[in-house]
């Protein structure tokens, strides 16, 4: 079934048809479009059976149309559906305005419906003239355009119309008067020299095609000097002028045949430059340095004359480029006074001569060779020398005994110190120093130096040997060691080694608590920053333990008896006797005796009583083994 035909306007020159129909039923549809008043022949369209809508363009504006449609199914035509609709009114332009006005251009703005026009046709016509109008077209999407290339201070009529394929709107018009040609701004002279000046001027950017500059000597009928420069410039150097001369300079701008009113300025060029401030300083002992002042870019060259004050005949002449303001004059005699003269040349003209006197320095010297910071393998050298003269210094190091190869160093003439290393310790050296300049070798100066000895660890000595220990002592260089390690090992290696760490200032260690009568090995090492010296070694045997022996009882009496004993000579400080009755019926008796004694009479005991006697010696606070005996007092 074909039904629901609707027709809507699509703009002012088209209609849109929509209808409904069963899916996949129709081979095609036939559409007929006819003006309602049947003025023009009907338009027929055949569209595929899959469509349910179609746009019909290219119709007349504001016109009623009758639209019919029928479908074809296997050659069968459905009943016709019809509808009526009108196209829209043709669009009009809105308003046109001149947004910006210059002296040679303007900006045109207008309003118009979106998408209505393919392009706009704009006509620019000078008012009150028969000159041909300027025509231009702009795309239909634009609403603004610049109109360049106009005349200054001129009335224009501008019309615009919108155009489609078969239609053009009613034109809109606007009238406008272009601005006057802009005037130049200020003309100033910013720099004046004796032969040139610099002009600066102001003007709106992008206005002028070019500028014409006229330079005329004031009060002179001579032909003026004309220059034409691009319109982008705002500054110009005018060279080739005469010194101390008044000039009139005029400037006008030109734009598309128009010329501005000229600007003028008067200026006087500077007087011819003079040389000034000639200064002469010594450059070492064989040269002088000249400095002078002069105007920049003024001189073609300078002529310098150098002669010894006392020798008028022998003068040196030099010609130098005009860009220089200083020069070194080498190859002179040391400690000699010189007169130096200079003049400049400007386009053949000579400036007045400037003169000065100066003396060269004394011949360079070296001295005060000094040796410092001596170590076992190195030392530092320092010396004095005339500054800025020497290219190199030569240092020779020779050992006094001539056993080693001579070492030679060549170092920069700027140096005043050197570090000499890689030398053997405890060695005498002679150091020779000489300076070399391009045309001189100084006399040689010398100094002596002796490298320090390596830090020593020596003379391990064992003293105060006794049964229980001994004293270890050694010699070492001052401040050479952080610490010492003393290791004591019994010769039979039966006991654990004993290790003693001592500060680097100590030089002895008293060892006690050793075993009597055995051999020991003692090793002493020094340490510097954790590095160990090879040890000094010594072997020692402790003395045998001193003995008390042969305790004898004699001469018994009712109240006592005599005791005697033997002991090592010179070992014991004293002896201790302990006496007690064997039945322990009385308090024990303890007697301390001085070392030399070997006998003692004991009295005050009970008669006919058995006593137990013990004896031991004391040496340096230690007890010897005890010896015992039994004794009985006589009957009363």
């Amino acid at each position: 079934e074909l039904e629901n035909l609707t027709v809507t306007e699509v703009g002012w020159d088209g209609l849109r048809l929509n209808w409904t129909a069963a899916d996949q039923a129709y081979e095609h549809f036939i559409i007929q479009v006819q003006e309602a008043n049947k003025v023009e022949a009907a338009r027929n369209l055949t569209v595929p059976g899959s469509l349910r809508a179609v746009d019909i363009p290219g119709l007349k504006a504001a016109t009623p149309y009758t639209v019919s449609i029928y479908g074809v199914i296997q050659g069968y035509r459905t009943p016709v559906l019809s509808a009526e609709a009108s196209t829209g009114e043709t669009p009009n332009l809105g308003e046109v305005v001149v947004a910006e006005v210059g002296w040679d251009a303007l900006k045109l703005n207008w309003t118009a419906p979106e998408g209505a026009y393919e392009y706009f046709f704009i006509q620019v016509q000078e008012a009150d003239t028969v000159e041909a109008a300027q025509n231009l077209t702009v795309p239909g999407g634009l609403r603004s355009t610049d109109l360049p290339g106009l005349k200054a201070a001129t009335h224009y009529t501008i019309t615009i119309r919108g155009v489609t394929q078969d239609f053009s709107t009613t034109p809109l018009s606007v009238e406008v008067l272009t601005e006057e040609v802009p005037d130049m701004g200020n003309l100033t002279v910013t720099e004046v020299s004796w032969d040139a000046l610099r002009l600066n001027w102001t003007t709106p950017d992008g206005t002028y095609d070019q500028f014409t500059i006229q330079v005329q000597e004031a009060d002179q009928v001579e032909e003026a000097h004309n220059l034409t420069v691009p319109g982008s410039l705002r500054s110009m150097e005018i060279p080739g002028l005469r010194a101390g001369t008044p000039y009139t300079v005029t400037l006008h701008g030109e734009v598309r045949g128009h010329s501005t009113r000229p600007l003028a300025v008067e200026v006087v060029t500077e007087d011819l430059p003079q040389l000034g401030d000639l200064a002469v300083s010594e450059v070492g002992w064989d040269g002088l340095r000249l400095n002078w002042t002069a105007a920049d870019n003024a001189y073609e060259h300078f002529v310098i004359q150098v002669q010894e004050v006392n020798k008028v005949e022998a003068a040196q002449n030099l010609t130098l480029p005009g860009s220089l303001r200083a020069v070194d004059i080498p190859g002179l005699e040391a400690a000699t006074p010189y007169r130096v003269s200079i003049y400049g040349v400007i386009r053949g003209y000579r400036t007045p001569v400037l003169s000065a006197e100066a003396s060269t320095a004394k011949e360079p010297e070296i001295g005060n060779l000094n040796v410092s910071d001596i170590t076992p393998e190195s030392f530092n050298l320092s010396w004095m020398a005339t500054d800025g003269i020497f290219e190199t210094f030569t240092i020779e190091i020779i050992d006094s005994n001539r056993l080693l190869e001579t070492v030679e160093y060549n170092i920069s003439g700027a140096e005043r110190t050197a570090h000499i290393s890689g030398l053997p310790p405890s060695t005498d050296f002679i150091v020779y120093l000489s300076g070399l300049a391009p045309s001189i070798r100084t006399k040689t100066i010398s100094a002596t130096a002796t490298t320090e000895a390596l830090p020593l660890l020596e003379n391990l000595t064992i003293s105060d040997i006794n049964p229980y220990g001994f004293t270890v002592s050694w010699m070492a260089s001052e401040n050479a060691f952080d610490s010492f390690l003393v290791t004591v090992v019994d010769s039979g290696k039966l006991l654990d080694p004993q290790e003693f760490t001592l500060s680097g200032t100590q030089r002895k260690l008293e060892l006690r608590g050793l075993i009597t009568g055995i051999g020991y090995e003692v090793m002493v090492s020094g340490f510097t920053q954790g590095h160990q010296t090879k040890p000094l070694r010594a072997e020692i045997v402790t003395e045998a333990e001193p003995e008390v022996d042969n305790l004898l009882v004699s001469d018994a009496t009712p109240d006592g008896f005599r005791l005697s004993w033997t002991a090592d000579e010179g070992v014991f400080d004293n002896f201790v006797l302990k006496i007690r009755d064997t039945k322990k019926q009385s308090e024990p008796l303890e007697i301390t005796l001085l070392a030399p004694e070997r006998t003692r009479d004991i009295t005050g005991l009970r008669e006919a009583t058995e006593y137990e006697i013990e004896l031991y010696g004391i040496s340096k606070g230690r007890r010897s083994q005890t010896v015992s005996a039994i004794a009985t007092t006589a009957m009363g």
Epitope: P376, E377, A480, D482, G530, H531, Q532
Partner: antibody, heavy 118, light 108 residues
Framework: EVQLVESGGGLVQPGGSLRLSCAAS????????MGWVRQAPGKGLEWVSA????????YYADSVKGRFTISRDNSKNTLYLQMNSLRAEDTAVYYC???????????WGQGTLVTVSR | SSELTQDPAVSVALGQTVRITCQGD??????ASWYQQKPGQAPVLVIY???NRPSGIPDRFSGSSSGNTASLTITGAQAEDEADYYC???????????FGGGTKLTVL
């Protein structure tokens, strides 16, 4: 486990200064002497400086004397090297190292690179 | 002098014995210490004192000293022993630590 971690290296212009730090752990810092050793690119080891346990004694190689200062903060277990007036020839990897009283440097950090260049 | 002199390079066949030497006046008084350094790593102490090895150092490394020369001996060199070896000593209070120039050991 003994650990020494250096920091503070970097790029510096000749004449400039840097301060290196070495954070220590895993041993009794206050009982160890400490030191700095450097190694220029492609070159051998060069001892630079050392300091005793409590920081009262310091030692320097001739090449850095008067320019470098070694110090330590036992409360922070940290060793320092203040480097002033740096020269191009001071460019190197700087290692922090420890040594107990009776042996040389027995533990080293992984190093920090100091580059002295314009 | 306190400069310790080492051969720049030494090579050894795998499993063979190699001796690296170090010469200097300071070695008359002090024992040398020896460090192994592999590329991109910090040095490792391998021998110090008369012939002491820190824990973890294989017993194929040993040290000896005679006169002004110290020696590091590797008995049965392994591929992992390929490294730079630096000797190190003291020269007393002014030059407390001195390193040799290093020896590059190649294990073939």
């Amino acid at each position: 486990e003994v650990q020494l971690v250096e920091s503070g290296g970097g790029l510096v212009q000749p004449g400039g200064s840097l301060r290196l730090s070495c954070a220590a752990s895993g041993f009794t810092f206050s009982g160890s002497r400490m030191g700095w050793v450097r190694q220029a690119p492609g070159k051998g080891l060069e001892w630079v400086s050392a300091i005793n346990e409590e920081g009262g004694q310091t030692y320097y190689a001739d090449s850095v004397k008067g320019r470098f200062t070694i110090s330590r903060d036992n409360s922070k277990n940290t060793l320092y090297l203040q480097m002033n007036s740096l020269r191009a020839e001071d460019t190197a990897v700087y290692y922090c190292a420890k040594h107990p009283p009776h042996r040389p440097f027995d533990y080293w950090g992984q190093g920090t690179l100091v580059t002295v260049s314009r | 002098s306190s400069e310790l002199t080492q051969d720049p390079a030494v090579s050894v066949a795998l499993g063979q014995t190699v001796r690296i030497t170090c010469q200097g006046d300071s070695l008359r008084l002090y024992y040398a210490s020896w460090y192994q350094q592999k590329p991109g790593q910090a040095p490792v102490l391998v021998i110090y004192g008369k012939n002491n090895r820190p824990s973890g150092i294989p017993d194929r490394f040993s040290g000896s000293s005679s006169g002004n020369t110290a020696s590091l001996t590797i008995t049965g060199a392994q591929a992992e022993d390929e490294a730079d070896y630096y000797c190190n000593s003291s020269h007393g209070p002014r030059r407390p630590v001195v390193f040799g120039g290093g020896t590059k050991l190649t294990v073939l």
